[in-house]
């Protein structure tokens, strides 16, 4: 069968039919349905939602919809023994206690099973001691404290403000600094945008609002007890002492009202500079300990959470491909939420639901995609990307042979200003071409394309007339597909204006106030931004599954490889003497990048000219495109991070959310001037250059003519 025979309708009409079927009103309805009660991973409520989604996807017309369950390590507060932090006086009496729960939002006062704020996977403990304020608890913040200010965090409880980097990195840094406990808080400087009211009157964080979240350092391992393998019925589980990524010190999150009570009494050193000051009416003294009258008072943490092996459920829906059923395009997003999930994840899940409905409608009319589309509703994303990772571990052999692309679908919005896309360079041209065909939802851009409004509001720093597309980092369910398996991946959502809103994420992230009303009243009353995101995500899936030649452009990889090589070389050249002393050369890397560029160019020429009616040649060329991302995988992984195997991209070692290019070389160079054995350190830099150069060259050769 030719592609058009298989699909019954011309490809252009298919895409239009698919996009026209997507309706804002449906997304709104689905969001409401998904957000009326909490859907915490491992709970009965979330299991029921999984079954509801399974049933609805079947009704929508998918060929099959199955639940895939795993028994993974989760973490919950003790219902009868709540977590809190105290200020204690010299007699040990508690003279102040942090809140036990967030003030419930209007209309939700009688909802049961709202999990109180906690740091998932915190160990139990009741440490007491002096407080040290560590700013954002980034690597550079601890450098400033320890190296410049000579402040020792050993045996101290540190208090850090949320923002800038993943909370797990903050905890890891605190542990390495010798802290015995961590308090995380949301400062209004980061979570309260000027001129906007706090919820329920606006989208800002009230003082009693608290950000939940896991504090793991899994580095892509998935379930902490079964790294590398699925947590199935016959799994061998590690003991808790050998579990991957668990923190070793108690951690607890608080809001800014409670933080004020702790920070106002701080003494010791003044903040080193204005970048350490937030917006509270406190001095932001670093400590250690309290000032003057309060110097005998200490801080005590009371953490009683428990880690429990708990069953989770993914929903996996299949729409079989008519021509290449053994080629998989995956659209996945998580279903579990910390509380109501008004934005995270249900604004994404509602979009996936509507995309499934639209595909199902086309299928009922006799259409099928060329390739198989898999739809996934992941569980336990909030507990460390567990549902997606376990499923990928269970199906890794199929995925590495058949996986064409993965499109992520968590929160559809984190603002309502413009589009934000992070993806593999292979998808740049797909995203550009698609957004040129879609209408912009933005005010002032009526009748203009999404590409135009996006480019105007978020221009590329390198290429004029093009929009910014960012590197993939982690902190979401694409991680295992991209960083471990090397499947081309991308994500899209509507975001805020980063120029004017310097706060981290969106203010109500992971709080009880992330409700349906937050979205419907303040972010997207017409659900037009949700619809646009559905068109982008759905359109990408449609093209990836239905285009005769895969919509990947390998030349864009060549461009970024040169950019990344230049960047890492310039970092290394900050140490010209050592480079000379230890004979460090980047020639092999630049040579490999040059070869990649030439071979990619020739491949693209052949791609224009080959006989697309020859199914064998078509399949061969498509396989070279599909396997290009795979070719950047090093089976040995990155140093000390075996599940991060992509040589070009990895989550930053200092911030899981951010992507780092040539991460092996970058980490080898990081803080190299402080290494005790410079010869060994520069030897590792040379080894990483070798690995990177080899990988780029090997990837280039996969694009050469096969014989």
């Amino acid at each position: 069968k030719s592609s058009n025979e298989a699909t019954n309708i011309t490809p252009k009409h298919n895409m239009k039919a698919f996009l026209d079927e997507l309706k804002a009103e449906n997304i709104k309805k689905f969001l409401y349905n998904f957000t009326q009660i909490p859907h915490l991973a491992g709970t009965e409520q979330n299991f029921q939602l999984a079954k509801q989604i399974q049933s609805q996807w079947k009704e929508f017309g998918l060929d099959s919809v199955e639940l895939a369950h795993y028994d993974v390590l989760l973490s919950y507060p003790n219902k009868t023994h709540p977590n809190y932090i105290s200020i204690i006086n010299e007699d040990g009496n508690e003279i102040f206690n942090t809140s036990l729960f967030e003030p419930p939002p209007p209309g939700y006062e009688n909802v049961s099973d709202i999990v109180p704020p906690f740091s998932a996977f915190s160990p139990q403990g009741m440490p007491e001691g002096d407080l040290v304020y560590v700013n954002y608890a980034r690597t550079e913040d601890f450098f400033k404290l320890e190296r410049d200010m000579k402040i020792n965090c050993s045996g101290k409880i540190v208090i850090a403000r949320y923002g800038k980097v993943f909370r797990g990195n903050k905890v890891k840094n605190a542990q390495l600094a010798g802290a015995k406990g961590v308090i995380l808080y949301s400062d209004p400087a980061d979570y309260f945008a000027p001129g906007v009211k706090s919820y329920p009157d606006g989208w800002n964080l009230p003082g009693g609002g608290v950000q939940r979240g896991n504090i793991l350092n899994l580095n892509g391992a998935g379930d902490p007890l079964t790294p590398g393998y699925p947590a199935n019925e016959y799994a061998y589980r590690r003991g808790i002492a050998e579990a991957v990524g668990l923190p070793s010190i108690p951690v607890h999150p608080i809001g800014y009202y409670d933080a004020q009570k702790l920070l106002e009494k701080m003494g010791g050193s003044a903040p080193p500079d204005s970048s350490w000051r937030g917006s509270l009416k406190v001095p932001y003294n670093v400590g250690p300990g309290f000032t003057g009258n309060f110097s005998t008072q200490k801080v005590k943490m009371h953490i009683h959470s428990t880690n429990e092996v708990t069953r989770i459920y993914n929903v996996i829906g299949t729409l079989r491909g008519a021509v290449e059923p053994d080629r998989y395009v995956i659209l996945g997003g998580h279903r579990d939420s910390w509380v109501f999930g008004g934005i995270d994840p249900q604004s994404g899940a509602a979009v996936v639901h509507e995309i499934v409905r639209s595909f199902g409608t086309l299928k009922k009319e006799g259409w099928r995609p060329r390739r198989t589309i898999l739809f996934a509703s992941w569980d336990a994303e909030e507990f460390g990307l567990l549902g997606s990772t376990e499923w990928a571990e269970e199906n890794s052999r199929l995925l590495q042979e058949r996986g064409v692309a993965y499109i992520n679908a968590d929160s559809s919005i984190e603002g309502n200003y413009t589009l934000r896309v992070d993806c593999t360079p292979l998808m740049y041209s797909l995203v550009h071409n698609l957004t040129k065909e879609l209408k912009s939802p933005d005010e002032g851009f009526e009748g203009k394309s999404l590409y135009e409004s996006w480019t105007k509001k978020s221009p590329s720093p390198e290429f004029s007339g093009m929009p910014r597309i960012s590197k993939l980092g982690s902190g979401n369910d694409f991680e295992v597909f991209f960083q471990r398996l090397g499947i081309a991946s991308g994500r899209a959502r509507y975001t805020k204006n980063w120029e004017t809103n310097k706060f981290s994420g969106y203010p109500l992230y992971h709080s009880v106030y992330e409700t349906y009303e937050l979205v419907e009243k303040f972010y997207d009353p017409m659900f037009k931004y949700h619809l646009t995101v559905a068109q982008v995500r759905g359109g990408m899936v449609f093209e990836l599954a239905n285009s005769i030649v895969l919509p990947f452009d390998c030349r864009d990889y060549a461009v970024v490889l040169r950019k990344y090589a230049d960047k890492i070389y310039s970092i290394s050249m900050k140490h010209p003497q050592e480079m000379k002393t230890y004979s460090v050369s980047f020639d092999s890397l630049f040579s490999a990048v040059k070869n990649f560029t030439e071979i990619a160019s020739k491949f693209s020429e052949r791609l224009q000219d080959f006989d697309k009616s020859n199914p064998i040649v078509l399949r061969m060329m498509n396989d070279q495109l599909m396997f290009l991302e795979r070719a950047f995988i090093d089976p040995l992984g990155l140093p000390d991070r075996p599940f991060y195997r992509h040589v070009i991209y990895a989550p930053s070692s200092h911030n899981k959310y951010a992507g780092e290019s040539f991460p092996g070389i970058y980490d080898a160079l990081f803080d190299i001037e402080s290494k005790v054995d410079p010869s060994k350190a520069w030897g590792e830099v040379k080894r990483q250059i070798y690995v990177a150069a080899f990988t780029v060259q090997a990837a280039a050769e996969t694009l050469s003519e096969v014989a």
Epitope: S99, P103, P105, P106, G208, Y257, Q260, E264, K281
Partner: antibody, heavy 122, light 107 residues
Framework: QVQLQESGGDVVQPGRSLRLSCAAS????????LHWVRQAPGRGLEWVTL????????YYADSVKGRFTISRDNSKNTLYLQMNSLRAEDTAVYYC???????????????WGQGTTVTVSS | YELTQPPSVSVAPGQTARITCGGN??????VHWYQQKPGQAPVLVVY???DRPSGIPERFSGTNSGNTATLTISRAEAGDEADYYC???????????FGGGTKLTVL
Amino acid sequence: QVQLQESGGDVVQPGRSLRLSCAASGFSFSGYGLHWVRQAPGRGLEWVTLISYDGSNKYYADSVKGRFTISRDNSKNTLYLQMNSLRAEDTAVYYCAKTTVSDPYYYGMDVWGQGTTVTVSS
Amino acid sequence: YELTQPPSVSVAPGQTARITCGGNNIGSKSVHWYQQKPGQAPVLVVYDDSDRPSGIPERFSGTNSGNTATLTISRAEAGDEADYYCQVWDSSSDHVVFGGGTKLTVL
């Protein structure tokens, strides 16, 4: 509409006990800190005690510490003040008041009840 | 911690009344102001130094710096006659503190 209504005021003898109640309506009771403030005849406002929205913190004026206990029942939308070992100087109009936000410390009291009168006299 | 208010302030109708509230380094604290008319419960007129609750006329404003907070009532009216109290939270004693009150007379 947002309302606080105190009750339980009475004439009592010194050394006796009394419990005041404050019934709330028209707002999300469990989300706000609450205070008791009193005003002796012809005198200014005197703060008595506060309780945080979740009951985790309670603070008392030195003049009532050890004798008065503040509590709340979020399921009944009611605030209480248990007054023991009453003295003549406790004679006053007792107001309950809600904070503008959940935090009971740094923020103002935006809704007040009409007050209930406690008279301590032999 | 103590807050000091003048016992009384007089103002002619249409003129501006200023009521002060003194306290050591009061500028570092959030100050709230209440109006109380005879036989009635107090009413919040300014909170967090200078913010006005809904329903309070724009004529009421506040400032706070150094050792003095000030409540300003511009274009005073007869209906503004009342006792006015300032209030702060004293974090060193964990107490709410009220000023002694100021009787405003509109002549």
